[in-house]
Interface confidence: low
């Protein structure tokens, strides 16, 4: 079935809507569970076979400021010994998140929603042989 | 809230953060970058601790479909191919912003909504508890 | 089609050991996992543990690590748990469920095996 | 663990009835939830599962929806052959866990 987009629905406009301008929309940024925490296992970035460190990037201009960011430690992946297989790969896994960016055209201030792709963590792969013919 | 740096030309405004409600475009940045990640690699096949996708789909929410992670197994795939029991599988979770529609059903008001989603699975050494 | 199929009730002392069966057919058992549940009227249905019969590989869960061992038989299709040092608290009834684990799902269950101990 | 709290514990309907039935979850579950059925001499069968996924075969007067920590199963309308427990589970964490079950009697 048709999967609407912002701007659009299949629901019936109720008349309790807030009047917008055209080509725009109205976003409260007062976030919804802003308090909820992430309840991950413990420590599984340094646990993983393919483990990760994590980067904070910080944007003044951009909500929320803070993105945090992963990168994989390794090419390949940690065995049983603790060293390195390079016969496996650590590979990042993404995930889209959206920000609220601001923008400064002279004096004046506009908000333009993007979307963000940060990567969360690594797992570990086979990789995939390509036969040279 | 955040603080901006002021661009001293301008007229002089207290509120350094961002408003509580801004009006936004209705084009999204980067809108069309790919998000089935059923398509966008195979590593939920391919890993040691593989996981199925979730079509979760709510049109109160942009975006409304969200693919939702969930581990195979409680344990790893060893080289034999066998799930290997004294390693775990956990689930990567990840809060991301999504965007609520708020009066319901409105079609140009939203409020921005944290969710925890599952996104991957890593293979982990266990924590072992020894009991005194 | 899928079934499972249990073995009988079990009247036995406290302190004894047993070993209850569950036969499965309709399917390649080394597939799919095996878990076992125990029900009681009291702390209603407990998740005991699992078992892929493909490699022998368990886990379980803490409060029956001492108390259930899950084992099966590829030949005979069959998955057992044995339950060791039996008390009254042990008196349940105990299902076999099968683990779609590709889906990530229980699907079919089988009858239940009601164990009494009792002196 | 997780913590299932299911209510109510008893339905007393009619058929006819529509009947709803809420799991709790004590930490967020995802869709990883599934709800069976229990007839009286019978296995447990599998009715939804992924929260809102309605299982092969199952009438559609057996629906149920939610995510996280909140979800509700239903029965648009109740008929004789519905008498059974009805209980909750959740597939998202080891160990997994059931809720306490509602029994469903036809008046």
């Known amino acids: 079935r048709k999967i609407p987009k912002v701007g659009h629905t299949f629901f019936q406009k109720p008349e309790s809507c807030p009047p917008v301008p055209g080509g725009s929309m109205k976003l409260d940024i007062g976030i919804i569970n802003e308090n909820q925490r992430v309840s991950m296992s413990r420590n599984i970035e340094s646990r993983s076979t393919s483990p990760w460190n994590y980067t904070v990037t910080w944007d003044p201009n951009r909500y929320p400021s803070e993105v945090v960011q992963a990168q994989c430690r390794n090419l390949g992946c940690i065995n049983a010994q603790g060293k390195e297989d390079i016969s496996m790969n650590s590979v990042p896994i993404q995930q889209e998140t959206l920000v609220v960016r601001r923008k400064h055209q002279g004096c004046s201030v506009s908000f333009q929603l993007e979307k963000v792709l940060v990567t969360v963590g690594c797992t570990c792969v086979t990789p995939v042989i390509h036969h040279v013919q | 809230g955040i603080t901006i740096p002021r661009n001293p030309g301008c007229p002089n405004s207290e509120d350094k953060n961002f408003p509580r409600t801004v009006m936004v475009n209705l084009n999204i940045h980067n809108r069309n970058t790919n998000t089935n990640p059923k398509r966008s690699s195979d590593y939920y096949n391919r890993s040691t601790s593989p996981w199925n996708l979730h079509r979760n789909e709510d049109p109160e929410r942009y975006p409304s479909v969200i693919w939702e992670a969930k581990c195979r197994h409680l344990g790893c795939i060893n080289a034999d191919g066998n799930v290997d029991y004294h390693m775990n599988s956990v689930p990567i979770q990840q809060e991301i912003l999504v965007l609520r529609r708020e009066p319901p059903h409105c079609p140009n008001s939203f409020r921005l909504e944290k969710i925890l989603v599952s996104v991957g699975c890593t293979c982990v050494t266990p924590i072992v508890h020894h009991v005194a | 089609q899928v079934q499972l199929q249990q073995s009988g009730a079990e009247l036995v002392r406290p302190g004894a050991s047993v070993k209850l069966s569950c036969k499965a057919s309709?399917?390649?058992?080394?597939?799919?996992?095996m878990h076992w549940v125990k029900q009681t009227p009291v702390h209603g249905l407990e998740w005991i543990g699992v078992i892929h019969p493909g490699n022998g590989g368990t886990a379980y869960n803490q409060k029956f690590r001492d108390k259930a061992t899950l084992t099966a038989d590829k030949s005979s299709t069959t998955a057992y748990m044995e339950l060791s040092s039996l008390t009254s608290e042990d008196s349940a009834v105990y299902y076999c469920?099968?683990?779609?684990?590709?889906?990530?799902?229980?699907?079919?269950w089988g009858q239940g095996t009601t164990l009494t101990v009792s002196s | 663990s997780i913590v299932m709290t299911q209510t109510p514990k008893f339905l007393l309907v009619s058929a006819g009835d529509r009947v709803t039935i809420t799991c709790k979850a004590s930490?967020?579950?995802?869709?990883?939830v599934a709800w069976f059925q229990h007839k009286p001499g019978q296995s447990p069968k599998l009715l939804i599962n992924y929260a809102s996924n309605r299982y092969t075969g199952v009438p559609d007067r057996f629906t149920g929806s939610g995510y996280g920590t909140d979800f509700t199963f239903t029965i648009s309308t109740v008929q004789s052959e519905d008498l059974a427990i009805y209980f909750c589970q959740q597939d998202y964490g080891s160990p997994y866990t059931f809720g306490g079950g509602t029994t469903l009697e036809i008046k």
């Open positions: 469920i099968r683990f779609l684990t590709y889906e990530g799902y229980f699907d079919y």
């Open positions: 309709g399917y390649t058992f080394s597939d799919y996992e």
């Open positions: 930490q967020s579950v995802n869709n990883d």
